[in-house]
Amino acid sequence: QSPIFGPQDVSSIEGNSVSITCYYPDTSVNRHTRKYWCRQGANGYCATLISSNGYLSKEYSGRASLINFPENSTFVINIAHLTQEDTGSYKCGLGTTNRGLFFDVSLEVSQVPEFPNDTHVYTKDIGRTVTIECRFKEGNAHSKKSLCKKRGEACEVVIDSTEYVDPSYKDRAILFMKGTSRDIFYVNISHLIPSDAGLYVCQAGEGPSADKNNADLQVLEPEPELLYKDLRSSVTFECDLGREVANDAKYLCRKNKETCDVIINTLGKRDPAFEGRILLTPRDDNGRFSVLITGLRKEDAGHYQCGAHSSGLPQEGWPVQAWQLFVNEESTIPNSRSVVKGVTGGSVAIVCPYNPKESSSLKYWCHWEADENGRCPVLVGTQALVQEGYEGRLALFDQPGSGAYTVILNQLTTQDSGFYWCLTDGDSRWRTTIELQVAEATKKPDLEVTPQNATAVIGETFTISCHYPCKFYSQEKYWCKWSNDGCHILPSHDEGARQSSVSCDQSSQIVSMTLNPVKKEDEGWYWCGVKEGQVYGETTAIYVAVEERTRGSPHINPTDANARAKDAPEEEAMESSVREDENKANLDPRLFADEREIQNAGDQAQENRASGNAGSAGGQSGSSK
């Protein structure tokens, strides 16, 4: 009696796929040992076809996979493009040899069934419409026409030309003739359900002179497409239900006990468990749409179905498409904070992981909006202008090679609360969702800038100070000038010796920035911030206005300004004559196809709906110049 368990008999037809799940006892050794699938030969030898060590036989090349799910103590063998040659005896097992623990599986692959010559085979998916063609001779042109369904020896009338319709086919079956044709009638059966499958006989006339045609109707249940995704990654369900439901409401549901629970539909319904991490995007006018879910959780695994019906809810007899989603807990995507908290007037630094192999990919940050199907307008990107309303308070700092980039948002308000997505134009799996929670501030901010009404005069020296608490003593302080393509750190030099943090004087912790001489282009937003290496912390922002010197205004000697700066022993004076170049560059057209509709160039197309202008500024965010 083997402790391995699986399906003893698997049967399918040529061209299909099978997915065989084998269950093993939950032990540490079993979870990590080799898993295999082998074919039993007449000589008793079991030839490996695929194993978890990476082995793949020639006959399975390009059509099979073996995936271990240690958290479920299962492994799955997927085999596609079946042929009758695949019929045979197999073993799924584990161990370093094929003699270890195993389970015997019999696989039988049949030909697509054939019927007698006079039988027309109709194969349709659930929810679709079939048109059965019935030929007759001229002598029966004026006779009664009918379609019946065989049940054992009997044939029960479905519909006839006297306008009788079987109650179970009411509003679904119609009998008609096309144009002037006098030798053929048709029966349409719409909204097909599994029990419609079977043998039908259409008849024109009565008795021995009647014309009869046999029709075999096969109603196919949707074959779930298997999707294997990593924990914390994203999945896209591409749904193409056909033109006939183009104008009906669309939905995605998840099968649960006796129902299929709607996750999202085009009528505005959305499951709270997917709040902030789901988007439904119409693809075209033919009823195609896609649903993107980010931040996959273990509990997201299961059977999903998309469909269409005016109610936005699943209905029997309406077309559907199905998937089975597996979520693998052995994920390459690092665990990052899903909730970030901030206070009004303060700032947050959000770390966005991305595939380290794609350091040159374009990085984006968008705000998930709940309206209707959900959308995610881009707020900032490595080559995207900062969205209106975020000027001076939002920047993206890329850290090439680190596998992460940082987005800083300051001057927070409670309106900033909500869900945000980190994404790139590269690997579509690396999409992270962050919930930002902004609470009312109960104390003064950690960083304070003086003077708060900053107006600099052209040609003069202007110094602005940033006061920081002792807790930031050991961190790197910086000033940067904000522009549409990031916040470029200004050069700094340390003035005076640092005192030990033990004797830190709370009132004298200041980092200053000096503009000398002030130029018109110095006008704009400046940030004071703290960081430790690549890890960004608190920031605060101030707008520096620049005006012409008015006649009679006192001219400040630059040396006096510097002298002022030297008075504060803990000041780190930063002097800047840096000029920001704002070279405009065109956005990658692959990335913003429909205004700013995010498009994944590698995998699925235009995965989330976004809006805004498509301008851009070149340059690397966050670099010191």
Epitope: F5, S11, S12, E221, P222, K257, A301, H303, P314
Partner: nanobody
Framework: EVQLVESGGGLVQAGDSLRLSCAAS????????MGWFRQAPGKEREFVAT??????????YYADSVKGRFTISRDNAKNTVYLQMNSLKPEDTAVYYC?????????????????WGQGTLVTVSS
């Protein structure tokens, strides 16, 4: 709501055969598996056999105690599952329950099934 109705139970001699039927009606939209469990007097309900399907592919699972003797099958058009029981033994005596559901996980686990029939008694005398 899905309704399951079992039939075909009865009293037979050891070594005889019996065929159980389970007809499903109602919203079978989310059903991807149907199976049989049994419960002998004073014992826990145990897995017997399950058939799972995906389009035109069928997967049949059996308990070790019935392998080679019992065969599960289904008639898609009739929404009915059958259990053909051959070479019956006295230890096969039990109430046989039909179960149905999405059966995403291990088919031997009772919780994988969302609907249950009332049961049909099979008595095998020696």
């Amino acid at each position: 709501e899905v309704q399951l109705v079992e039939s075909g139970g009865g009293l037979v001699q050891a070594g005889d055969s019996l065929r159980l039927s389970c007809a499903a009606s109602g919203r079978t939209l989310t059903t991807y598996g149907m199976g049989w469990f049994r419960q002998a007097p004073g014992k826990e309900r145990e897995f017997v056999a399950t058939i799972k399907w995906s389009g035109s592919t069928n997967y049949k699972y059996y308990a070790d105690s019935v392998k080679g003797r019992f065969t599960i099958s289904r008639d898609n058009a009739k929404n009915t599952v059958y259990l053909q029981m051959n070479s019956l033994k006295p230890e096969d005596t039990a109430v046989y329950y039909c179960a149905a559901g999405t059966v995403l996980g291990d088919p031997r686990v009772l919780n994988e099934y969302d609907y249950w029939g009332q049961g049909t008694l099979v008595t095998v005398s020696s």
